[in-house]
């Protein structure tokens, strides 16, 4: 990724200029954009940039509101990285079972399932 | 989802099935299957439930392991019907700066991010 | 910035027992597996074990197999190597290491904790 | 269990020399090798992992190469710091095994 910061300091960064630019974000009443219904984002990972697009092009650029789309796109470009990284080891099953345990322990411990 | 028990615990019983049949499962020596490099797990759901087709017809099947792959294929429907989810609803950029600061914080904070 | 912590070693008798702890911090700990690798004093290196982040799965060299147990304790962030009918050809020093990623084991290692078997 | 052969157990070579160190697998681990280098009394430092990655911060003097039983540890040019014992090590499965170890000194 083409960026001088770490990527954790990418997110913190974006997060405080998410709010910093929030009321000119807003400005657009009629616009209305996919927003999942539900907690599991990173399930949603497509839908949610696919929504910054539609934002970026409805919003006027300048100053540091480019920044946070600049931002926006370093983090696409880094949750592309490590989907591509999904398959890129063929491993023997011992390993796939130790990463599928993990999986399931985290859906069972991190994720919002709803009954 | 057809199946009588909530998400939650199906998922418990998984793991449980996981680690009795891990014996059986791990028997094939030459078996390669894509295992992820990072611990994202949500990213990389389709080629988990890729790598578990691979194991399904590489198993001898009876007896409650083919309860786990029955379990495991229904935990796959449930993720689909969240993807699904994804884009279901269109709303105000008010409501997608919540999902979006929402993502931000969860990549912050729980995402396992190397530098 | 990752710190592993190894203590517990010491000078102890053939057939006795000794628990070593690794304290990690620096990372989210529960999502990594650990191992123990030890270094006979002037030899190679030699992987003891290994556990998975969640602890579901634990791996021995056949060395060990039946005498030593790894362990973990995701709220404390620490590791544990419990070693019994401990025997000379056990004295080593012994490190905790953290994972890079999925089964890339030995990324960051703790400084080591020195174990000597001898009566 | 995999057995990995490390040559040569020790070499001896000038500031600025080329340095290379070998790494043979008795199975095929496809590209799941590691290098370490240790100084005298210290840890273990990753430097290479999968073969021919370099780990962060490691010098770009140091390179690693080879697939499926055949590897290659490289310095390009030894420099004083460089001093070490170096080891290889697979994660292709357990038990994880590591080679006997090269040791590297100035001329």
């Known amino acids: 990724i083409p960026t001088e910061i770490p990527t954790s300091a990418l997110v913190k960064e974006t997060l405080a200029l998410l709010s910093t630019h929030r009321t000119l974000l807003i400005a657009n009443e009629t616009l209305r954009i996919p927003v999942p219904v539900h907690k599991n984002h990173q399930l949603c990972t497509e839908e949610i940039f696919q929504g910054i697009g539609t934002l970026e092009s409805q919003t006027v650029q300048g100053g540091t509101v480019e920044r946070l789309f600049k931002n926006l796109s370093l983090i696409k470009k880094y949750i592309d990285g490590q989907k591509k990284k999904c398959g890129e080891e063929r491993r023997r099953v011992n390993q796939f079972l130790d990463y599928l345990q993990e999986f399931l322990g985290v859906m069972n411990t991190e994720w919002i399932i709803e009954s | 989802i057809p199946t009588e028990i909530p998400t939650s615990a199906l998922v418990k019983e998984t793991l449980a099935l996981l680690s009795t049949h891990r014996t059986l499962l791990i028997a094939n020596e030459t078996l390669r299957i894509p295992v992820p490099v990072h611990k994202n797990h949500q990213l990389c759901t389709e080629e988990i439930f890729q790598g578990i087709g691979t194991l399904e017809s590489q198993t001898v099947q009876g007896g409650t392991v083919e309860r786990l792959f029955k379990n495991l294929s229904l935990i796959k429907k449930y993720i689909d019907g969240q993807k699904k989810k994804c884009g279901e609803e269109r709303r105000r950029v008010n409501q997608f700066l919540d999902y979006l600061q929402e993502f931000l914080g969860v990549m912050n904070t729980e995402w396992i991010i190397e530098s | 910035e990752v710190q592993l912590l190894e203590s517990g070693g010491g000078l102890v008798q053939p057939g006795g027992s000794l628990r070593l702890s690794c304290a990690a911090s620096?990372?989210?700990?529960?999502?990594?597996?650990m191992s123990w690798v030890r270094q006979a004093p002037g030899k190679g290196l030699e992987w003891v074990s290994t556990?998975?982040?969640?602890?579901?799965?634990?791996y021995y060299a056949d060395s060990v197999k039946g005498r030593f147990t790894i362990s973990r304790d995701n709220s404390k962030n620490t590791l544990y190597l419990q070693m019994n009918s401990l025997r000379a050809e056990d004295t080593a020093v012994y490190y905790c290491a953290k994972e890079r990623y999925n089964w890339n084991y030995l990324h960051y290692w703790g400084q080591g904790t020195l174990v000597t078997v001898s009566s | 269990d995999i057995q990995m052969t490390q040559s040569p157990s020790s070499l001896s070579a000038s500031v600025g020399d080329r340095v290379t160190i070998t790494c043979q697998a008795s199975?095929?681990?496809?590209?799941?090798l590691n290098w370490y280098q240790q100084k005298p009394g210290k840890a273990p430092k990753l430097l290479i992992y999968?073969?021919?990655n370099l780990e962060t911060r490691v010098p770009s003097r140091f390179s690693g190469s080879g697939s499926g039983t055949d590897f290659t540890f490289t310095i390009s040019s030894l420099q004083p710091e460089d001093i070490a014992t170096y080891y290889c090590q697979q994660y292709d499965n357990h038990p994880l095994t590591f080679g006997g170890g090269t040791k590297v000194e100035i001329r």
């Open positions: 999968s073969a021919s």
């Open positions: 556990i998975s982040g969640s602890g579901g799965s634990t």
């Open positions: 199975q095929d681990i496809i590209n799941y």
């Open positions: 620096g990372f989210t700990f529960s999502s990594y597996a």
